[in-house]
Interface confidence: low
């Protein structure tokens, strides 16, 4: 089975999330400050002319970029696209923001700065007060809260109206922990790192975030090629060399939002064995209900068979037997020189009466600035609300 069951199409996860149509209530829109009540956060809805026509912060955003507009989506969403406008004011508004940054959070405590696939944080904004400028977020971000930080190159007034586009994140995956992806040296270097991981990287381990293994982009048969434009060889895959793991396996841990009964895990793997990539020989998963609890029961073990000689990339389905947990730890056994994964998703059901986890289970956030964002797939359920998704820009899958 080369397809990911339940795999969502990122191009369709582009529904307006409720600023303009007011399904996001005023109480879920806030700001660091407002110039006046008539430019309060609640007036920041795209295409709205309420109040004085936008949110305008009290302070200058130059030189310090500390003012922000915050939208609380209440549940985790994949945010694939944002739209911005300046101040309406009956057509008399002159204030807009030529650029801005985004920060986002899944738990309200740890905030991450959005970056594009090349590490650029600053997003081009508006050139006038009325035009709507849409920005495709590549990579998209999994967030409950999103903050817009308007920028200016001099002391000036800036005002903002916004919309967010995406879909609900139903899979419940909060983070995965994995060893840092490595570089394969062929005729050219193939960079198999998780380049959109938004957690922490410490001592060869990435934890507390999501990244390319949950971004909905399935890798190609030839791992040197990519679905994305203008990226480096190996971009779609995260890979590890057998030589670096004396244990003979790569271990990953997955944290979910609440207790779930897990039916299966789907891992999209490369099997270009002529270049050393092999499906895992087997997978072993352990389960626990809380971060400080013991692993429960026997691990689930699954040996992989099938046509291992077929060099095509494919999804491997690992049955998980309905085991109930909030944390999974899985070991992927090497069957060749390299393991290359492009996606990992889970088929699960929320256990009735289980409360969402409060924030992450990670320590006070370690150092370097959290990287860019993630995305996931059986995670996502489209929520049309009657409207059509915003069409993609031409060119790149994530513009």
């Amino acid at each position: 089975d080369a397809d990911m069951k339940g795999h969502f199409d990122p191009a369709k996860c582009r529904y307006a999330l409720g600023m303009q149509d007011r399904t996001i209530p005023d109480s879920d829109i806030s700001a660091s400050s407002s110039w006046s009540d008539s430019t309060a956060a609640r007036h920041s809805r795209l295409e709205s002319s309420d109040g004085d026509g936008a949110w305008c912060p009290a302070g200058s955003v130059f030189p310090k970029e500390e003012e922000y507009l915050q939208v609380d989506l209440q549940r985790l969403h994949l945010v694939a696209l944002v739209g911005t406008q300046g101040r309406h004011a009956g057509g008399l508004g002159k204030e807009f923001s030529r650029s801005y940054r985004l920060r986002y959070s899944r738990d309200g405590r740890r905030w991450m700065g959005w970056k594009d696939r090349w590490g650029q944080e600053v997003i081009s904004g508006n050139e006038d007060p009325e035009g709507v400028v849409l920005k495709d977020l590549g990579p998209p971000m999994v967030a409950r809260l999103v903050r817009f930080y308007p920028r200016a190159d001099r002391v000036m007034s800036v005002c903002l109206r916004v919309e967010l586009y995406g879909c609900l994140w139903r899979d419940g995956l909060l983070s995965y922990t994995a060893p840092v992806g490595q570089t394969m040296y062929l005729s050219e270097a193939v960079y198999l790192n998780d380049s959109t991981y938004d957690g922490h990287t410490v001592g060869g381990l990435q934890y507390g975030g999501l990244g390319q293994l949950a971004d909905g982009v399935v890798g190609l048969d030839d791992f040197r090629k990519s679905q994305e434009l203008r990226v480096w060889p190996g971009y779609d895959y995260v890979g590890w060399s057998n030589h670096s793991f004396s244990s003979g396996y790569v271990e990953m841990e997955f944290e979910f939002d609440r207790l779930r009964a897990f039916q299966a895990m789907q891992v999209h793997c490369n099997n270009m064995h002529t270049l050393g990539a092999r499906l895992p020989g087997g997978v072993e998963c352990r389960f626990r209900r809380g971060p400080a609890m013991a692993w429960e029961g026997e691990p689930m073990r699954h040996n992989l068979g099938g046509n291992l000689g077929d060099p095509r990339a494919r999804a491997v389905s690992v049955p998980l037997g309905g085991r109930v947990a909030r944390f999974l730890q899985c070991r992927f056994l090497f069957a060749g020189p390299w393991l290359l994964f492009s996606e990992i998703s889970f088929i699960s059901d929320v256990v009735n009466n289980s409360s969402p986890a409060l924030g992450g289970t990670f320590p006070p956030a370690p150092w370097w600035p959290p990287g860019p964002p993630p995305t996931n797939f059986s995670s996502l359920e489209l929520e049309p609300r009657g409207q059509q998704p915003v069409a993609k820009a031409e060119g790149s899958p994530t513009a």
């Epitope: 381990l205 934890y207 320590p363 006070p364 956030a365 370690p366 370097w368």
Partner: antibody, heavy 121, light 107 residues
């Protein structure tokens, strides 16, 4: 109050083993990265190793194989197991807590008072 | 492993002097650098983290600067209680090396 207290240091013969303890109070050890650092008499600080919140351990190259860091969450205690001790392991051994915040690493803000290990025949 | 080299290893100065201590990393380490002060028989005390940020309660005469591989701790006007040994430390957690230390002595 929030503190770290090391114990277990004593005079030990070369080739023997010793386990040092670092008991935390006022916070949970397993929410932080914890380090062991030592200081030989008249010398500088020397990093031994680190244990992450998830029990991943990292060691200085010279410490690998002879030194093992672990912890008992139920006792809120960090351990340093030292094997095949040598005279050059004579030092004051400190445990320290790595603090972090929204913008990154905030340094080793909390240290124990240290415990002296003397390796001598 | 990254090595941290401090210089000078010792410095003699008088009260009121400006003292500068440098720390050089064997490769670029970004901003994950801290400075500590240690007095004889005592545990180290954190002065500065993240290259520039002053730990709460530390006098403003201490300041940190630098980027990449070269970092500096400056004491703008040395006070009697500042005579001690100072260490830099890099914390990536794959390894966490300290510099060799700089002893600030009374001239």
């Amino acid at each position: 109050q929030v503190q770290l207290v090391e114990s277990g240091g004593r005079v030990v013969q070369p080739g023997r083993s010793l386990r040092l303890s670092c008991t935390a109070s006022g916070f949970s050890l397993n929410r932080y990265y914890m380090l062991w650092v030592r200081q030989a008499p008249g010398k500088g600080l020397e990093w031994i190793g680190t244990i992450s919140y998830g029990d991943t351990t990292y060691y200085a190259s010279w410490a690998k194989g002879r030194f093992t860091i672990s912890r008992d969450n139920s006792k809120n205690t960090l351990y340093l197991q030292m094997n095949s001790l040598r005279a050059e392991d004579t030092a004051v051994y400190y445990c320290a807590r790595a603090d972090t915040g929204d913008n990154g690493y905030l340094g080793l803000q909390l240290w124990g008072q240290g415990t002296l290990v003397t390796v001598s025949s | 492993d990254i090595q941290m080299t401090q210089s000078p290893s010792s410095v003699s100065a008088s009260v009121g002097d400006r003292v500068t201590i440098t720390c050089r990393a064997s490769q670029s380490i970004g901003s994950v650098l801290a400075w500590y002060q240690q007095k004889p028989g005592k545990a180290p005390k954190l002065l500065i983290y993240g290259v520039f940020s002053l730990q709460s309660g530390v006098p403003s005469r201490f300041s940190g600067s630098g980027s990449g591989t070269d970092f500096t701790l400056t004491i703008s006007s040395l006070q009697p209680e500042d005579f001690a040994t100072y260490y830099c430390q890099y914390i990536p957690y794959g390894s966490s090396p300290f510099g060799g230390g700089t002893k600030v002595e009374i001239k």
